[in-house]
Interface confidence: low
């Protein structure tokens, strides 16, 4: 028969023959022949291959370096890589999470819109009219101005995005 020019799924072409690819978690030891099937071997400890492949070496699991603020989120298997995340209070510098940076605080006049996670930084938002934040914080939202009316008081000093309103007693002479 004519030698094949293309192979089926999960096969590869070598020496005019279609050989089976090794399954995920295994590496190639030797190609198939006319008489023998592809020889594969399981990946060793701390190694993986996540696709049907003809690789002669497995990939090393990612190392979550604690010196870079990383810790293991999900341990790797022979078919999956280790997933790293950042220590509490830090977040990844990239999607691959190769190192971490400190969560940042929102300055006075800004509140936390979204608290930081292991993969995303703190998201700050300016305090809108009627709200304020007087601290630099990585977790505090903008607080609403005090309602003087509900306390039977009047506004003596207007609030800003950084300060609360100041309430005071009503001037009874002008009531």
């Amino acid at each position: 028969p004519e030698p094949p020019t293309a192979c089926r799924e999960k096969q590869y072409l070598i020496n005019s023959q279609c050989c089976s690819l090794c399954q995920p978690g295994q590496k190639l030891v030797s190609d198939c022949t006319e008489f023998t099937e592809t020889e594969c071997l399981p990946c060793g400890e701390s190694e993986f291959l996540d696709t049907w492949n003809r690789e002669t070496h497995c990939h090393q699991h990612k190392y979550c370096d604690p010196n870079l603020g990383l810790r293991v989120q999900q341990k790797g298997t022979s078919e999956t890589d280790t997933i790293c995340t950042c220590e509490e209070g830090w977040h990844c510098t990239s999607e691959a999470c190769e190192s971490c940076v400190l969560h940042r605080s929102c300055s006075p006049g800004f509140g936390v819109k979204q608290i930081a996670t292991g993969v995303s930084d703190t998201i700050c938002e300016p305090c809108p009219v009627g709200f304020f934040s007087n601290v630099s914080s990585a977790f505090e939202k903008c607080h609403p101005w005090t309602s003087c009316e509900t306390k039977d008081l009047v506004v003596q000093q207007a609030g800003t995005n950084k300060t609360d309103v100041v309430c005071g007693p009503q001037d009874r002479l002008r009531a």
Epitope: G89, W90, V101, L102, S105, C124, S136
Partner: antibody
């Protein structure tokens, strides 16, 4: 205004321990990341350690890892640096510094520094 | 670790003239949010360091506008448009992107 005052320095024999303190005022201490930085006589600045605002995360320079411990007491507005097994190369002025947070990343206010001399 | 280098290490200046200091990082300090996590500090003789520039190009509060920072990624420059006598001291760059945070070796600026 922001004020950081270091204390606890002095002359110490090699191999001994020392605890430096940094008293903070003029800002909400518990909301800020804090650093220690040191400077050997006639040399440049060397970053030593950092601690998150709530004390849950701490990181160190490779040169001090295992011997130095950074800690804080937010109720006392105080940052600490415990130095064990002191060596001659630890002789330096030690500064505590506040991190400016998201708006101003990195140390934005520094203390006046405290001298630690390691000598027999 | 990110290694920081500065040049020159010594810079004699003439009052009224411009001055420029270069800082280079061994890997990019440009974060995905578009900011460069690089600060500049001045340590005047006998004093603690003071923050001049943060996030690569932002002047810290109270810093005169003759100081400016520029650059991105791995190459940064601190410029003084017209040097004054009070500007003498050692200038340091520092990366604050990832731990361990690291300083450059410093540039000593003095009057000619």
């Amino acid at each position: 205004q922001v004020q950081l005052v270091e204390s606890g320095g002095g002359v110490v024999q090699p191999g001994r321990s020392l605890r430096l303190s940094c008293a903070a005022s003029g800002f909400t201490f518990s909301s800020y990341v804090m650093h220690w930085v040191r400077q050997a006589p006639g040399k440049g600045l060397e970053w030593v350690a950092v601690m998150s605002y709530d004390g849950s995360s701490k990181y160190y320079a490779n040169s001090v890892k295992g011997r130095f411990t950074i800690s804080r007491d937010n109720s006392k507005n105080t940052l600490y640096l415990q130095i064990n097994s002191l060596r001659a190369e630890d002789t330096a002025v030690y500064y505590c510094a506040r991190d400016g947070g998201k708006a101003v990343p990195g140390p934005d206010y520094w203390g006046q520094g405290i001298l630690v001399t390691v000598s027999s | 670790d990110i290694v920081m280098t500065q040049s020159p290490l010594s810079l004699p200046v003439t009052p009224g003239e411009p001055a420029s200091i270069s800082c280079r990082s061994s890997q990019s300090v440009l974060y995905s949010n578009g900011y460069n996590y690089l600060d500049w500090y001045l340590q005047k003789p006998g004093q603690s360091p003071q923050l001049l520039i943060y996030l690569g190009s932002n002047r810290a509060s109270g810093v005169p506008d003759r100081f400016s920072g520029s650059g991105s990624g791995t190459d940064f420059t601190l410029k003084i448009s017209r040097v004054e006598a009070e500007d003498v001291g050692v200038y340091y760059c520092m990366q604050v992107l990832q731990t361990p945070f690291t300083f450059g070796p410093g540039t000593k600026v003095d009057i000619k």
